[in-house]
């Protein structure tokens, strides 16, 4: 058993069939010695009495919020939340694993840059009764600063006949150089609470693996003087990290017809223009990767090329 | 500390092509490494990641742009001196900085290339023949230290009387390929910040 | 007493379905994940499937995806196997078996697929 | 496609300690925990060893398993005319987990 916060308390629990579960005492928060009764949730049931109340936590029907009380006056609570050790691994009920890059992935995580700001995602079908508390470090044995916000929910999707929910978070790094070769990953810590169930996921990457850029902004068509030619020409996005000759990206520009089954033309490029055959209820998208540190492509920049 | 603007003209400067190559090369070899290796930790999650160089050379600070000195967290402390004259400094106006930066790039070379001459030298003794160094890389090592052209003494090449342990030499291939590519991603950068500036 | 009782097994035509029962006692039954293995004669163990103790997400052995759905209703505390063109090669003696460090499994059930 | 590898027998004479090995690859054995199951013919498996070397209550102390690595070992000190049976390993791999791999299987066999 360990204190997850204050009065708050995690049973970790080896999970199967007539398992013998924890013994756990539970100490009231008083002076008082004599007179003390323990309840367990709402109930009035009497569980115990004296300072000090030994319980046999098997099912989570032994977990919840007992309290100490002494002539109906509450002295303290103590709230139980399970574990679930699941033949030698902890439960993953509550988020969904999202199966990308590979199985096993809760935990998603992007940064539009290298300034050490970066924003994690991670899915769930729970609606109500839930909590997520998010920590993160450089390095894990001499972690060095890294601030979370709150984590707030930030889609709502319907899949079949289940509600999907997102939730996300944006943390950043307390002392950053953009420029600076990572030899620590950064690590990121989420703690789940489901009703009185309680859960962990992790997530460890280098800022440089998780490099998305924004699309490429300004995206424009030049029509070429008697050519079914076009001068395509963009910016590199706001949000992408300067210098830009230091932080330099590399550039795919693709016409597609109307149709997806139409062939799509792809051109790849350092320079920020290109030239491009339009077709006739074609579009034309360009998109952004760092060019030296092959990270995730942005998504798509595009115009039609009516 | 830092990258002046003042640097040579975008013509002049035959060190870009030669970053490109090295890139190229050292990320193939370590594709190579990953798939040839399946078996071996080889992949950035599953190894240590070290620095050969680590309070050697300073390149990141060294050669780092004028627009991130500003940055407090970008300002390391550490100060290494080195030689400063290189065939890529192609005009006069290049600054100590910048010699400064050049030659602790060409360091970092000749530490890699001291490393894996010596790593591969022991994998040639392996009798599983599993992975050698990729002569191509070891090749476009030499074409940067030549375009850099600083003179500096040559580092011995360390021979082992041990028998190699073929395993841990294998780890420590990947090890390296990993810092040598973080490195070189490092390289391209400041030789596109120069040629640009 | 952790009890697995399974039933359902028998012989049967390639092609055609069956459906494995296992009725579980002495334990809250919607509170564990459970899984079916098989063992084809004189052959070693095979994992078949997995379902959480919720129902909410299934697993299953590459040679049976598509064709063999397991399910579990907690309020009749039954798991099930339901196995559709069934093939020679899955005649096998098919176990369940509660997830965990300790395991209980079925008494095990014969289905023999033989035209 | 058993990726956990046992040898196919092993024998001993009453008395003597026989050991079965379980090979694997790092994202099985290499990074899960490891069981071991007795089965006498005609009956369900038994657990003998789940989390790599611990012993269910009513399991002899005689039987004791280890791991190193990418590989596990059940160890039968002074095996008895009653552990003639066959001897599973299994662990999960760490990409398709809750899914049990199980080893290919040992048959140990008492001489005498």
């Known amino acids: 058993i360990w204190e997850l916060k204050k009065d708050v308390y995690v049973v970790e629990l080896d999970w199967y069939p007539d398992a013998p579960g924890e013994m756990v005492v539970l100490t009231c928060d008083t002076p008082e010695e004599d007179g003390i009764t323990w309840t367990l949730d709402q109930s009035s049931e009497v569980l115990g009495s004296g300072k000090t109340l030994t319980i046999q936590v098997k099912e989570f029907g032994d977990a919840g919020q007992y309290t100490c009380h002494k002539g109906g006056e509450v002295l303290s609570h103590s709230l139980l939340l399970l574990h679930k050790k699941e033949d030698g691994i902890w439960s993953t009920d509550i988020l969904k694993d999202q199966k990308e890059p590979k199985n096993k992935t809760f935990l998603r995580c992007e940064a539009k840059n290298y300034s050490g700001r970066f924003t994690c995602w991670w899915l769930t079908t729970i609606s109500t009764d839930l909590t997520f508390s998010v920590k993160s470090s450089r390095g894990s044995s001499d972690p060095q600063g890294v601030t979370c916000g709150a984590a707030t929910l930030s889609a709502e999707r319907v899949r079949g006949d289940n509600k999907e929910y997102e939730y996300s978070v944006e943390c950043q790094e307390d002392s950053a150089c953009p420029a600076a070769e990572e030899s620590l990953p950064i690590e990121v810590m989420v703690d789940a609470v489901h009703k009185l169930k309680y859960e962990n996921y992790t997530s460890s990457f280098f800022i440089r693996d998780i490099i998305k850029p924004d699309p490429p902004k300004n995206l424009q068509l030049k029509p070429l003087k008697n050519s079914r030619q076009v001068e395509v020409s963009w910016e590199y996005p706001d949000t992408w990290s300067t210098p830009h000759s230091y932080f330099s990206l590399t550039f795919c520009v693709q016409v597609q017809g109307k149709s997806k089954r139409e062939k799509k033309d792809r051109v790849f490029t350092d320079k920020t223009s290109a030239t491009v055959i339009c077709r006739k209820n074609a579009s034309i998208s360009v998109r952004a990767q760092d060019r030296y540190y092959s990270s995730s492509w942005s998504e798509w920049a595009s115009v039609p090329c009516s | 500390r830092n990258l002046p603007v003042a640097t040579p003209d975008p013509g002049m400067f035959p060190c870009l092509h030669h970053s490109q190559n090295l890139l190229r090369a050292v990320s193939n070899m370590l594709q190579k490494a990953r798939q040839t290796l399946e078996f071996y930790p080889c992949t950035s999650e599953e190894i240590d990641h070290e620095d050969i160089t680590k309070d050697k050379t300073s390149t990141v600070e060294a050669c780092l742009p004028l627009e991130l000195t500003k940055n407090e967290s970008c300002l390391n402390s550490r100060e290494t001196s080195f030689i400063t004259n290189g065939s890529c400094l192609a005009s006069r106006k290049t600054s100590f900085m910048m010699a400064l930066c050049l030659s602790s790039i060409y360091e970092d070379l000749k530490m890699y290339q001291v490393e894996f001459k010596t790593m591969n030298a022991k994998l040639l003794m392996d009798p599983k023949r599993q992975i050698f160094l990729d002569q191509n890389m070891l090749a476009v090592i030499d074409e940067l230290m030549q375009a850099l052209n600083f003179n500096s003494e040559t580092v011995p090449q360390k021979s082992s009387l041990e028998e190699p342990d073929f395993y841990k030499t294998k780890i420590k291939l990947c090890i390296l390929l990993h810092a040598f590519r973080i490195r070189a991603v490092t390289i391209d950068r400041v030789m596109s910040y120069l040629n640009a500036s | 007493q952790v009890q697995l009782v399974q039933s359902g097994g028998g012989v049967v035509q390639p092609g055609r379905s069956l459906r494995l029962s296992c009725a579980a006692s002495?334990?809250?039954?919607?509170?564990?994940?459970m899984h079916w293995v098989r063992q084809a004669p004189g052959k070693g163990l095979e994992w078949v499937a997995f379902?959480?103790?919720?129902?909410?997400?299934?697993y299953y052995a590459d040679s049976v995806k598509g064709r063999f759905t397991i399910s579990r209703d907690n309020s009749k505390n039954t798991l099930y196997l339901q196995m559709k063109s069934l093939r020679a090669e899955d005649t096998a003696v098919y176990y369940c078996?509660?997830?965990?460090?300790?395991?209980?499994w079925g008494q095990g059930t014969m289905v023999t697929v033989s035209s | 496609s058993y990726v956990l590898t046992q040898p196919p027998s092993v024998s001993g004479t009453p008395g003597q300690r026989v050991t079965i090995s379980c090979s694997g690859g790092r994202s099985n054995i290499g990074s899960e925990t490891v069981k071991w199951y007795q089965q006498l013919p005609g009956t369900a498996p038994k657990l003998l060893i789940y989390?790599?070397?611990q012993r269910p209550s009513g399991v002899p102390d005689r039987f004791s398993g280890s791991k190193s690595g990418t590989s596990a070992s059940l160890a039968i000190t002074g095996v008895q005319a009653e552990d003639e049976a066959d001897y599973y390993c299994q662990s999960y791999d760490r990409g398709t987990h809750p899914a049990l791999l199980f080893g290919t299987g040992t048959k140990v066999t008492v001489l005498g």
């Open positions: 078996k509660t997830h965990g460090s300790h395991d209980n």
């Open positions: 002495g334990f809250t039954f919607s509170s564990y994940g």
């Open positions: 989390g790599n070397d």
């Open positions: 379902i959480r103790y919720d129902g909410s997400n299934k």
